[in-house]
Amino acid sequence: THLGIRLPLRSGLAGPPLGLRLPRETDEESEEPGRRGSFVEMVDNLRGKSGQGYYVEMTVGSPPQTLNILVDTGSSNFAVGAAPHPFLHRYYQRQLSSTYRDLRKGVYVPYTQGKWEGELGTDLVSIPHGPNVTVRANIAAITESDKFFINGSNWEGILGLAYAEIARPDDSLEPFFDSLVKQTHIPNIFSLQLCGAGFPLNQTEALASVGGSMIIGGIDHSLYTGRLWYTPIRREWYYEVIIVRVEINGQDLKMDCKEYNYDKSIVDSGTTNLRLPKKVFEAAVKSIKAASSTEKFPDGFWLGEQLVCWQAGTTPWNIFPVISLYLMGEVTNQSFRITILPQQYLRPVEDVATSQDDCYKFAVSQSSTGTVMGAVIMEGFYVVFDRARKRIGFAVSACHVHDEFRTAAVEGPFVTADMEDCGYNIPQTDESTLMTGRA
């Protein structure tokens, strides 16, 4: 569904930084585009609550109207609430902006559950804790919606950071990041560090929490440890990548790698879970259950529905396996793997049992639209969206939640043959890009 699973996700306080910083390796730093080193003004510019989305503060219009905007690498429209709604504290008031221009065109975006619709226009946009620029960008002013905004989420709009091909109503509507790069000298790259809470937050903590960083125009080396490994962007629509192998605690799922990418694999900050195609999900759950077989958990837990609670501080992380995804590397027949811990795929849920309990939902779920590497994956890593070089980079996040025995990892290279065969070729029809069901 769009809610809770597809769009909204959100996370709170940053986990503890790694105790040991790995020495920086001289990988490809000299080749990295954009400003290098420190982007102090952009660090910690995201906020969030687990399961409800990470948002950045933006201003629109003249004089500037401040709104919190969900950061979504799985869509391509900049869309903001522009009419009163019970779940919105504030909204974009076009009539108060002297720089608003009406495009006299409507836009309608249906999801599997829910929808939003609105009117297209342009206005001046800036990001206070981002680059010091103002750009004229397309804005969809949301006038009607259903199951889109989330009560208490604290965001009022969505910033789609993917490519024009999936923009609504069509690919002629230039996405925000394209406008930003065209109108400024900002390099065509951004990076995300999403910091999961790692433990349930009460409402007070959640409201005051730091969620992470969106670095626009480059890479901040303080946000990761070790080296960055890059995987090619297969096609510029979603941020599509190719998974070549999946392991649970080092055990290969041994599936035809096409299954892992059926019908695509994308990196999506607007999705909470790691979502897997049906066959892959079933095999992965079977393997995770086997690895944690000293315990039995309720059936509804594996469906992402029931919560499992442990006395505070006693969650048995060690009985749950790590999950490794091998991604196509930049070099022929070379891959690398990213490994997440149960601290990433068991999502803390606040305010359900007693304060003496830590409660979690299983945040791996089934998909009918391919693999979605959502927050569950991204919260383990610093993720670089290097649009200029058509690649996505992964490094271990300096804020990922872990324990004294295991940490998330990005490792390589591994020799993997015939990786091109792992990609699924979607039959092209006129309708193919109209499937916005983000269930």
């Epitope: 000293t294 039995k296 029931q306 359900v352």
Partner: antibody, heavy 120, light 108 residues
Framework: QLQLQESGPGLVKPSETLSLTCTVS??????????WGWIRQPPGKGLEWIGM???????WYNPSLKSRVTISVDTSKNQFSLKLSSVTAADTAVYYC????????????WGRGTLVTVSS | EIVLTQSPATLSLSPGERATLSCRAS??????LAWYQQKPGQAPRLLIY???NRATGIPARFSGSGSGTDFTLTISSLEPEDFAVYYC??????????FGGGTKVEIK
């Protein structure tokens, strides 16, 4: 068909340890689809979950009783047991053993129950 | 902590009448809710699980409905053997340790 039967002393002195055993007949306790639990009911009152155990020995306890409760399993005898230490009159209740089925979420089969009175 | 509140505490009805029992959760438990029947001197018996599924051997006159926070157990036409105490239990937060306080259905 599967049956559960509680056994143990009906009278326990204050500060002592209450010990009960549940014998499972008509099926194996080692079947992986179930937990095996204890629930109690003070006279004239509602139901209180005490805890449960998996055949592997993994246990889950009610936080309010955790410091005093031990549940164990003996797969060779097809039995699981409850020990509740430092009992007081407030622990007087009918004690039921039950199977936790339907996705290990509900108590789908119960023993008849045994009344344990705490009194000197 | 999730609290289950059952109402009414006592329901006085005649055989053949329809009984409607309510269980309200302090926060959503999705559809992870069960109903049990307990007759005097007997152990509870599972009637309904997952809000609306009848357990094995339970007569069709018993039905459950609801999701989220509000649930109902309906006995379409009371038989003499249905006069008992009924408990609800949630399993959304697991382990499943929360029961409601009970509703007594007595003969009017």
């Amino acid at each position: 068909q599967l049956q559960l039967q509680e056994s143990g002393p009906g009278l326990v002195k204050p500060s002592e340890t209450l010990s009960l055993t549940c014998t499972v007949s008509g099926g194996s306790i080692s079947r992986g689809s179930y937990y095996w639990g204890w629930i109690r009911q003070p006279p004239g009152k509602g139901l209180e979950w005490i805890g449960m155990i998996y055949y592997s020995g993994s246990t889950w306890y009610n936080p309010s009783l955790k410091s005093r409760v031990t549940i164990s399993v003996d797969t060779s005898k097809n039995q699981f047991s409850l020990k509740l230490s430092s009992v007081t009159a407030a622990d007087t209740a009918v004690y039921y053993c039950a199977r936790v089925g339907h996705g290990v979420s509900y108590f789908d089969l119960w023993g008849r129950g045994t009344l344990v009175t705490v009194s000197s | 902590e999730i609290v289950l509140t059952q109402s009414p505490a006592t329901l006085s009805l005649s055989p053949g009448e329809r009984a409607t029992l309510s269980c309200r959760a302090s926060q959503s438990v999705s559809s992870y809710l069960a109903w049990y029947q307990q007759k005097p001197g007997q152990a509870p018996r599972l009637l309904i699980y997952d809000a609306s599924n009848r357990a094995t051997g339970i007569p069709a006159r018993f039905s459950g409905s609801g999701s989220g926070t509000d649930f109902t157990l309906t006995i379409s036409s009371l038989e003499p053997e249905d006069f008992a105490v009924y408990y609800c239990q949630q399993a959304y937060v697991w382990p499943p340790r929360t029961f409601g306080g009970g509703t007594k259905v007595e003969i009017k």
